[in-house]
Interface confidence: medium
C-alpha cells in the first residue's frame, strides 16, 4: 500500500514539475527590465528564450522572435538545450511511469518489470529536474553578470554627460517557475526510485525446504546432527520437520521481511 502511494505521489509530483518546466520554457518573462533609474518609463521590456516583448503603459504589447542566432548570447543556446532535454526526458519518463504504476494492470507484467520501469522513470525525472534547474541557473547567472556590467556602463559617457544607458535586466517570473518545477520533478524522481525498492521482489538468502516423510506418524528428528553440531535442545532452530501429507499452502516457511500482510 505504502509503495503504491509513494509511486503514485511521485508520478503526480513529477507530472506537475514537468508541466512547470514546459510552462517556464515557453514563458516570455525570463528577464524583465529593471525600472530603477530608467529614463523612459512608458515602455517595459521583458525577454524569454524565444522572443523579446515590449509592453507599453497603455497595455499594448508587441513581441518579436529571435529569428537569428547572431547577436544572441551563446549561453542562451545552452539554456534552450538544457530546457528541451529536460522536457524530452521528463515526457519519456512520464510515459514509462504510466506503465510502471502498480495500480495499472497491463497483461501479465511482473513486479520486477514494473520495478525496473519505475526506477528508469525515476532516474529520467531526476535528470530532467537537474536539467531544468541547471538551465534556469545558467540564465540567472547570465542575468547577474549582465546586470553588473550594465551598472558599470550606466555612468560612463563623453564629457560627463551620459550618452547611452544600457538597460538592466532582472529575474523574471519564468526563472522562479523553472526552479520550483525542476525541484518538483527531482523530488518526484526520488520518490519513484524509493518506490522501486519496495516493488522489487528481492531474493531471500535461504530457501525453505519441506520434507515429506512416507509414513504419517513418523517424525524426522536428526539426532546425530544435533549431537555432532552442539545445537543441543534446538532452542534457536525451532522448526521441526514432521512428516505427513500437506498441501502446498499448508507448508510452513520462514517469514520474510518482504512478506506483506
Amino acid at each position: 500500500m505504502a509503495v503504491t502511494a509513494c509511486q503514485g505521489l511521485g508520478f503526480v509530483v513529477s507530472l506537475i514539475g514537468i508541466a512547470g518546466i514546459i510552462a517556464a520554457t515557453c514563458m516570455d518573462q525570463w528577464s524583465t527590465q529593471d525600472l530603477y533609474n530608467n529614463p523612459v518609463t512608458a515602455v517595459f521590456n521583458y525577454q524569454g528564450l524565444w522572443r523579446s516583448c515590449v509592453r507599453e503603459s497603455s497595455g499594448f504589447t508587441e513581441c518579436r522572435g529571435y529569428f537569428t542566432l547572431l547577436g544572441l548570447p551563446a549561453m542562451l543556446q545552452a539554456v534552450r538545450a538544457l530546457m528541451i532535454v529536460g522536457i524530452v526526458l521528463g515526457a519519456i519518463g512520464l510515459l514509462v511511469s504510466i506503465f510502471a504504476l502498480k495500480c495499472i494492470r497491463i497483461g501479465s507484467m511482473e513486479d520486477s518489470a514494473k520495478a525496473n520501469m519505475t526506477l528508469t522513470s525515476g532516474i529520467m525525472f531526476i535528470v530532467s529536474g537537474l536539467c531544468a534547474i541547471a538551465g534556469v541557473s545558467v540564465f540567472a547567472n547570465m542575468l547577474v553578470t549582465n546586470f553588473w556590467m550594465s551598472t558599470a556602463n550606466m555612468y560612463t559617457g563623453m564629457g560627463g554627460m551620459v550618452q547611452t544607458v544600457q538597460t538592466r535586466y532582472t529575474f523574471g517570473a519564468a526563472l522562479f517557475v523553472g526552479w520550483v518545477a525542476g525541484g518538483l520533478t527531482l523530488i518526484g524522481g526520488v520518490m519513484m526510485c524509493i518506490a522501486c525498492r519496495g516493488l522489487a521482489p528481492e531474493e531471500t538468502n535461504y530457501k525453505a525446504v519441506s520434507y515429506h516423510a512416507s509414513g504419517h506418524s513418523v517424525a524426522y528428528k536428526p539426532g546425530g546432527f544435533k549431537a555432532s553440531t552442539g545445537f543441543g535442545s534446538n532452542t534457536k532452530n525451532k522448526k521441526i520437520y514432521d512428516g505427513g501429507a500437506r498441501t502446498e499452502d499448508e507448508v510452513q516457511s520462514y517469514p520474510s521481511k518482504h512478506d506483506y500482510v
Epitope: 523612459v40 521590456n45 523579446s52 515590449v54 499594448f60 537569428t68 547577436g71 544572441l72 542562451l76 549582465n146
Partner: nanobody
Framework: EVQLVESGGGLVQPGGSLRLSCAAS????????MAWYRQAPGKGREWVSE???????DYADSVKGRFTISRDNSKNTLYLQMNSLRAEDTAVYYC????????????????WGQGTLVTVSS
Amino acid sequence: EVQLVESGGGLVQPGGSLRLSCAASGSIYRINAMAWYRQAPGKGREWVSEITSTGNTDYADSVKGRFTISRDNSKNTLYLQMNSLRAEDTAVYYCAAFIIPSVGMFTSRTYWGQGTLVTVSS
C-alpha cells in the same frame, strides 16, 4: 552606433512658440519610446514628456496643455511643439530614446542627445 541630434532651440519671448526636433540615426532595429527631458541652469534633469511607438503620450503637470509631443516613425524623428512659453521653461532640452538596436538579448539601451538650449526671455 545610434545617435540622437536635437535642433530647433533658441531665444524666444514669453508667450511665444518653438518646435524642437530630435532625429535618430544609426543601426536602429526599433525605437520603442522617446522622451523629452530638460535641465535648467543649476538644477537636475526633469522629465517633460514621452511618446510610445503606438503614439501613447504622457506629460509633466507643468507643461500639460502647452506642450505637444509627436513622432514620425518613418523618419525616426521626435518633435516637441512648445506654446505659451514661460521664463521657467528656460533650459537645455534633451531627447531620450529607448531603442533595441538589433534583434537579440540584453541589447536595448536608452540613448541621449547632446541637448539644445531654449531661452525664454523678454
